[in-house]
């Protein structure tokens, strides 16, 4: 399963038809056309990742499809529309005042997006206000060529940010994961995501989440007390989508945060995470950039032990083996470490309580000229039952005020002759990282020590 190619498309897809969602025009699909597409679904899920340059794993280590390759393939696939949600855009070196050859893949991606617009393929972008890339000109360049861009004022609406990272292509294909539209996400930051091909049911369900952002991106938008019915989802943790992915029986659904952006039927992201944790009986392996059982960006900080308690309860009450891999980089907030030590302190093998925490350090090497890079940005969790791929770090803000999406997938093992289930693939990726020399136990991480690779 290391590198998967998308299927070839035999049929021409009907054009997107703009449809009103109650707040001006929206890039959406007519219900009848949607039904036609769903009959042609042959869903395929491919895990994708970015491995930063100069981060060699042991010879023979498995890997997922390179993210840059997957993104370019998705754009090659596009025939009608590309809808992108991303915290910020920074696809060129000059965006961040850096001259480095590793930005070339991002620049190629920006070029490809401009070519799409030249071929009359519509591009709709929902991005955050506030943002991290205030100097970037990417969106101005794309807007000048006809892209629709909306800055969603999450700072004003929920006191958060739009932190989601996903694409919906032709109402049929999906990318979602940890990577923003940033060249560093392709060559300098470790990322994990999923691409789902030929899956209109799920794509159009995720499109509804995109539409929640889209309508909030108009001037003077307000959060609706109740979302109109056309934003509702019928795919959730109680009624997941069921289908064959490459012949494998699969259930899947998308969750969203914050609750204020969860129309009827949408499972909140936190609820999805807790449900996956709660159903685990053997192990919970999680890889997240940050882990804070507190609020993160609001003053005064509040204690928020929801996820922390769930991990502790799973380990203590059910004997579930918990492994938490947290990132450690130059821009990591060191106040995180006491919480990690506290969690690990629960471990007591004699009492069958197993909690292990490690930090993943990406060596900076000769890339010190690139700010906010050389970090493991992934946000995923895997149990023996399910895979969870998300866009949120683990602290309160990301679930209460900031937008994010999660993908929960469960595949039935044994039904297919070749290839592992998604949760097995994700477990193998986790274990590759966990057992690598870049994953350091907390004992090897002196309090207050910078997250600098010691080799």
């Amino acid at each position: 399963w290391q590198v998967r190619r998308p299927p070839t498309w035999g049929q021409v897809q009907p054009k997107d038809v703009p449809r009103s969602w109650g707040h001006g025009s929206s890039p959406a699909l007519e219900p009848l056309e949607a039904e036609v597409r769903k009959q042609r679904d042959s869903c395929q899920l491919v895990l994708v990742e970015s491995i930063p340059q100069d981060l060699p794993f042991a010879a023979g280590s498995l890997s997922a499809q390179p993210l840059g390759q997957a993104w370019l393939q998705l754009l090659d696939t596009a025939q009608e529309s590309v809808h992108v949600a991303s915290y910020y855009w920074s696809l060129t070196g000059p965006d961040i005042g850096v001259n480095d050859s590793s930005s070339q893949l991002g620049e190629a991606l920006l070029q490809k997006l401009q070519q799409l617009l030249g071929r009359n393929i519509s591009l709709a972008v929902a991005t955050s206000s506030p943002t991290l890339a205030r100097k970037s000109t990417d969106l101005q360049v794309l807007a000048a060529r006809g892209a629709q861009v909306r800055r969603v004022p999450m700072g004003r609406l929920t006191r958060g940010v739009l932190h989601s990272k996903f694409w919906v292509v032709d109402g049929r294909h999906i990318y979602m994961g940890s990577a923003n539209m940033d060249w560093r996400s392709l060559t300098q930051v470790k990322e994990l995501g999923a691409v789902i091909y030929n899956c209109s049911h799920l794509a159009q369900d995720l499109e509804k989440t995109f539409q929640t952002y889209w309508v909030l991106g108009v001037p003077k938008a307000v959060l609706p007390k109740t979302w109109p019915q056309n934003f509702s989802s019928h795919i959730n943790r109680f009624q997941p989508f069921q289908g064959l992915f490459d012949g494998v029986p699969t259930t899947a659904y998308f969750s969203a945060s914050p609750p204020a952006l969860c129309p009827q039927g949408r499972t909140p992201d936190l609820e999805a995470l807790l449900a996956v944790m709660g159903s685990a009986q053997e192990f919970i392996y999680a890889s997240v950039m940050e882990y804070f059982p507190t609020t993160r960006f609001s003053h005064p900080r509040r204690y928020w032990p929801v996820l922390d308690n769930a991990l502790r309860a799973a380990a203590f009450s059910k004997g579930v083996r918990v492994r938490l891999l947290v990132s450690c980089g130059l821009n990591t907030d060191p106040t995180m470490f006491p919480y990690l030590r506290s969690l690990q302190a629960l471990s007591n093998p004699a009492a069958n309580v197993s909690v292990d925490v490690k930090v993943f350090i990406v060596p900076v090497g000769n890339h010190s000229n690139i700010p906010f890079s050389r970090v493991n940005h992934s946000k995923f969790m895997v149990t023996e039952k399910a895979a969870y791929i998300g866009t949120s770090n683990w602290s309160e803000d990301y679930f209460s005020s900031t937008t994010g999406v999660g993908l929960v997938v469960t595949q039935s093992p044994g039904a297919q002759p070749a290839g592992a289930t998604v949760q097995e693939q994700l477990r193998q990726l986790f274990e590759r990282d966990w057992s690598s020399r870049y994953a350091v136990g907390l004992d090897g991480q002196a309090p207050g020590q910078d997250c600098v690779w010691q080799g």
Epitope: Y87, L132, F297, S327, D333
Partner: antibody, heavy 124, light 107 residues
Framework: DVQLQESGPGLVKPSQSLSLTCSVT???????YYWSWIRQFPGNRLEWM?????????NYNPSLKNRISITRDTSKNQFFLKLNSVTTEDTATYNC?????????????????WGAGTTVTVSS | DIQMTQTTSSLSASLGGSVTISCRAS??????LNWYQQKPDGTVKLLIY???RLHSGVPSRFSGSGSGTDYSLTISNLEQEDIATYFC?????????FGGGTKLEIK
């Protein structure tokens, strides 16, 4: 508690260089913040002069052209301002301050800790 | 550079009352605005960041609002210790720029 303290000569002659030190206690200047110099002219106007980042990179106010340099000594946890070719227009109270925090994903930056300031008069 | 203008250089208000200090940017700064308090002894303190968010330890009597180019700081239930000069500052772009300050006095 994080504290910043400015020091340096209170009187500088025109055309000479002004050199100031900011000593930081309670936090490493190699971590998570931009370490800035801000000056306040008589009459209260504040001007951001520039910073040295936690990683040693710099950014300067274009209005100061090529006159300014901000450096650091991480072993002493100090950073420094050097302003060349001063004139009487550079008479001001000079403050050091930290801006950030530059944590992954944080879009909110502010000067959350300031030094008390040191007054520099440029006069012959 | 983005110019920040505080048109009122000084104003006076009564103890227990409230006062609003305004700040205008020369272009849209998309809420990237902070407010600072400078006491008569020169001490500077962050009050509000990103237009309306109270910094740690700042009393809830202080509040901020605004969007686009126009922003304001409101102090309600004025206390003697609020006698100070208040500055706005944009962090939308470099160079960072400050307003000229508004000196608050008690009637």
């Amino acid at each position: 508690d994080v504290q910043l303290q400015e020091s340096g000569p209170g009187l500088v002659k025109p055309s000479q260089s002004l050199s100031l030190t900011c000593s930081v206690t309670g936090y490493s200047i190699s971590s998570h913040y931009y370490w800035s110099w801000i000056r306040q002219f008589p009459g209260n106007r504040l001007e951001w002069m520039g910073y040295i980042s936690y990683d040693g990179s710099n950014n300067y106010n274009p209005s100061l052209k090529n006159r300014i340099s901000i450096t650091r000594d991480t072993s002493k946890n100090q950073f420094f301002l050097k302003l060349n070719s001063v004139t009487t227009e550079d008479t001001a109270t000079y403050n050091c301050a930290r801006e950030g925090p530059l944590y992954y994903g944080n879009p909110y930056w502010y000067f959350d800790v300031w030094g008390a300031g040191t007054t520099v008069t440029v006069s012959s | 550079d983005i110019q920040m203008t505080q048109t009122t250089s000084s104003l006076s208000a009564s103890l227990g009352g409230s006062v609003t200090i305004s700040c205008r940017a020369s272009q849209d700064i998309d809420n990237y605005l902070n407010w600072y308090q400078q006491k008569p002894d020169g001490t500077v303190k962050l009050l509000i960041y990103y237009t309306s968010r109270l910094h740690s330890g700042v009393p809830s009597r202080f509040s901020g609002s605004g969007s686009g180019t126009d922003y304001s700081l409101t102090i309600s239930n004025l206390e003697q210790e609020d006698i100070a000069t208040y500055f706005c500052q944009q962090f939308n772009t470099l160079p960072r720029t400050f307003g000229g300050g508004t000196k608050l006095e008690i009637k």
